[in-house]
């Protein structure tokens, strides 16, 4: 039995539970997913059960193998998986134990603009980067273009202090989980500060 | 790649020995059972028997009992079948095939054939 | 021994056209049976395996379908390489594996 194998898939796409054995016997093969058995496979005897009639079109057996392949990935199929390999030649059964992270392919993702100051000709404001549909474990940078030096931030809210007279400069945030990313559309530091020209001391949202 | 590559062509006299071998590369040869299947001219498949190389344990169909002989070789990765008081009705195409992990009666990677014809 | 009944013998068909081969068990075989597809002057190649379970690289046209002593082979479009002689097989518990006799499919 060795250490809990961390596997990562896409929604829609498929992830295979790598599983090998030496043992000339196996009696049974038995999966289950969160306590709930998934497949029970007799390889002697020829046998693959799969427990719910739905699973049966998303579980194969790449190469004819041990190792579990799951297609059509749902959110919810995220969990702990474990394996038993059962034999007679075994005192006690071969085990593995995986997690499953099931995400989500990013949409483009959105800016909203905090409050905006224009004191002095330099405008300043913090633009937030966030998805719509709060998925998980999204990590969010930050590109400014167009100083000398391409700049890089990390997180979701970037701070912004641009003078008028400088060189435009161009903001896009891009979010990343581990199947995917995704770019915001560019924002233009002149676009954005417009609404506040007029008004050297104003604010607005 | 899997690969099984099977010894050429024999010809033999009634009540002789042939010796057809099975050199198995790229997977681990001593973790899978290794089948010998028989097509005769205008027959059905017959299966004849099995070997675990890493024990040397073998299974044969009934009707082949003292007839075939299987046996293998780790250290060359090579399966042997001898057939014994050959007659002509022992004249056909010998493979030799890997189980699946999976389902250990279905063969998912076969040798080109050996052709065995037993003639006066 | 199990004995496996194919049927038809022969068959004659059009590319495009929709395939079906059966294979009956003289006993309850489960879910272990095996198809493979056989070309003149080669090996046969594994198809399907316990029943269902299509083999690496197999077109999705082939399925297989069945359990217990009656199953059934379905190409669901005939392509041109897939004219060939099919074998269904048991591969169900102790040995002897069996095997039908095969059913060739040939260009009508």
């Known amino acids: 039995s060795g250490p809990v194998k961390e596997l990562v898939g896409s929604v829609g796409g498929a992830v295979t539970f790598p599983l090998k054995s030496k043992v000339k016997q196996v009696d049974s093969i038995v999966w289950t997913f969160n306590t709930t058995p998934l497949v029970t496979i007799q390889p002697e005897g020829g046998t693959i059960i799969v427990t719910q009639n739905r699973n049966r079109e998303r579980v194969d057996f790449p190469d004819g193998g041990y190792s579990l392949k799951l297609s059509k990935l749902k959110k919810n199929d995220s969990g702990i998986y474990y394996v038993g390999i059962y034999s007679s030649s075994l005192q006690q059964p071969s085990t593995q134990e995986y997690v499953l992270h099931v995400y989500e392919h990013l949409s483009k993702p959105k800016v909203t603009m905090g409050l905006q100051s224009n004191k002095n000709g330099t405008c300043v404001t913090n633009l937030t980067c966030c998805m719509e549909h709060g998925e998980e474990d999204v990590i969010y940078t930050w590109k400014a273009l167009g100083q000398a030096a391409n700049e890089s931030h990390n997180g979701s809210i970037l701070p912004i202090s641009w003078r008028w007279g400088e060189s435009d400069m161009t903001f896009i945030c891009v979010a990343r989980n581990p199947v995917s990313r995704n770019f915001s559309s560019p924002i233009l530091a002149r676009k954005l500060c417009e609404g506040a020209a007029d008004d050297p001391d104003s604010s607005m949202v | 790649q899997v690969q099984l590559v099977q010894s050429g062509a024999e010809v033999k006299k009634p009540g002789a020995s042939v010796k057809v071998s099975c050199k198995a590369s790229?997977?681990?040869?001593?973790?899978?059972?290794m089948n010998w299947v028989r097509q005769a001219p205008g027959q059905c498949l017959e299966w004849i028997g099995r070997?675990?190389?890493?024990?040397?344990?073998?299974k044969y169909n009934g009707k082949f009992k003292g007839k075939a002989t299987l046996t293998a070789d780790k250290s060359t990765s090579t399966a042997y079948m001898e057939l014994s008081s050959l007659r002509s009705e022992d004249t056909a195409v010998y493979y030799c095939a890997r189980s699946t992990m999976i389902a250990t009666g279905a063969m998912d990677y076969w040798g080109q054939g050996t052709l065995v014809t037993v003639s006066s | 021994d199990i004995q496996m009944t194919q049927s038809p013998s022969s068959l004659s068909a059009s590319v495009g056209d929709r395939v079906t081969i059966t294979c009956k068990a003289s006993?309850?075989?489960?879910?272990?049976v095996a198809w493979y597809q056989q070309k003149p002057g080669k090996a046969p190649k594994l198809l399907i395996y316990?029943?269902?379970y299509r083999y690496t690289g197999v077109p999705d046209r082939f399925t297989g379908s069945g359990s217990g002593t009656d199953f059934t082979l379905t190409i669901s479009s005939l392509q041109p390489e897939d004219f060939a002689t099919y074998y269904c097989?048991?591969?169900?518990?102790?040995?002897?594996?069996?095997f039908g006799c095969g059913t060739k499919v040939e260009i009508k």
């Open positions: 790229g997977y681990a040869f001593s973790s899978s059972w």
């Open positions: 097989q048991q591969h169900y518990s102790t040995p002897p594996y069996t």
């Open positions: 316990s029943a269902s």
């Open positions: 070997i675990y190389p890493g024990d040397g344990d073998t």
């Open positions: 006993q309850d075989v489960s879910t272990a």
